[in-house]
Amino acid sequence: KAMHVAQPAVVLASSRGIASFVCEYASPGKATEVRVTVLRQADSQVTEVCAATYMMGNELTFLDDSICTGTSSGNQVNLTIQGLRAMDTGLYICKVELMYPPPYYLGIGNGTQIYVIDPEPCPDSD
């Protein structure tokens, strides 16, 4: 079987625009270097949201200006995306690449539909 990547079908972002989900993969080999990428698919366009490479047993580190944070535990990655607005609602796909040692493997999940609802502004008090 090909490398399977599992992620939840639906996640609702918090009122502060934060969404978290788990991306889990079944590794066909003993990878020591793994790259995890979050892709967003909307209107058939796919864009990269964020990406991080980690060494097995080490922490997942995204770039400082990334909207993503995450932790890893074995073949499971806990991803958090911040700063989401209603317009960011869409399908967020987890892509896992086993980079080292060779051979390279690619696994792509079916995606997590993240719904973001902008909070209602507080009504003015009379």
């Epitope: 892509k95 051979p103 792509i108």
Partner: antibody, heavy 110, light 103 residues
Framework: VVQPGRSLRLSCAAS????????MHWVRQAPGKGLEWVAV????????YYADSVKGRFTISRDNSKNTLYLQMNSLRAEDTAVYYC?????????????WGQGTLVTVSS | TQSPSSLSASVGDRVTITCRAS??????LNWYQQKPGKAPRVLIY???SLQGGVPSRFSGSGSGIDCTLTISSLQPEDFATYYC?????????FGPGTRVDIE
């Protein structure tokens, strides 16, 4: 034309896209035969993978400041005779080749 | 393995080419067309996604190990050689090709 056992370096000058953002490949095709994937290099040059038939003899490299991809071919054999294509991997799936060069014929013969 | 290795067909025919993988990787399968003396061009990527600019008569499908390329109504410009290729694991191997000739 190059003699068996000798070396040759192929270059591929890319234009029309952000070269530094894309993985790049070499694919070859022997006369009258099918396509054979040769090697890939990641956008930043950090990772390289090779076909078993060229491992240890060929080296893929790139210069992002010059938008150029290279293939250093050492210890050439008659079976390396082929048209060599450079190709771009897509940003989402590096193994999908969406733009190809016109190819250059390499003939290894004494 | 890719089958058939060659086929003869007429304009307007429906043509199906199959690529059988050793594992369930159809989602990571691409299809290319190559005409004599020309570089290949990608038609279908990720099993069923049509590359921009490719006519809609080309379609890809498959799940598990059997992946297919279908040309719904063969046109004169479609006579060429077709290759499948997997992008799941290195080496990114190509199938041996299917030559589509005029009957």
């Amino acid at each position: 034309v190059v003699q068996p056992g000798r070396s040759l370096r192929l270059s591929c000058a890319a234009s029309g896209f952000t070269f530094s953002s894309c993985g790049m490949h070499w694919v070859r095709q022997a006369p009258g035969k099918g396509l054979e994937w040769v090697a890939v290099i990641w956008s930043d040059g950090s990772h390289k993978y090779y076909a078993d038939s060229v491992k240890g003899r060929f080296t893929i490299s790139r210069d992002n400041s010059k938008n150029t991809l290279y293939l250093q071919m050492n210890s050439l054999r008659a079976e390396d005779t082929a048209v060599y294509y450079c190709a771009r991997g897509t940003m989402i799936v590096v193994g999908t080749l969406d733009y190809w060069g016109q190819g250059t014929l390499v003939t290894v013969s004494s | 393995t890719q089958s058939p290795s060659s086929l003869s067909a007429s304009v307007g025919d429906r043509v199906t080419i199959t690529c059988r993988a050793s594992q369930s990787i159809c989602n990571y399968l691409n299809w290319y067309q190559q005409k004599p003396g020309k570089a290949p061009r990608v038609l279908i990527y990720a099993a069923s996604s049509l590359q921009g600019g490719v006519p809609s008569r080309f379609s890809g499908s498959g799940s598990g190990i059997d992946c297919t390329l279908t040309i719904s109504s063969l046109q004169p410009e479609d006579f060429a050689t077709y290759y499948c290729q997997q992008s799941y694991i290195t080496p990114f191997t190509f199938g041996p090709g299917t030559r589509v000739d005029i009957e």
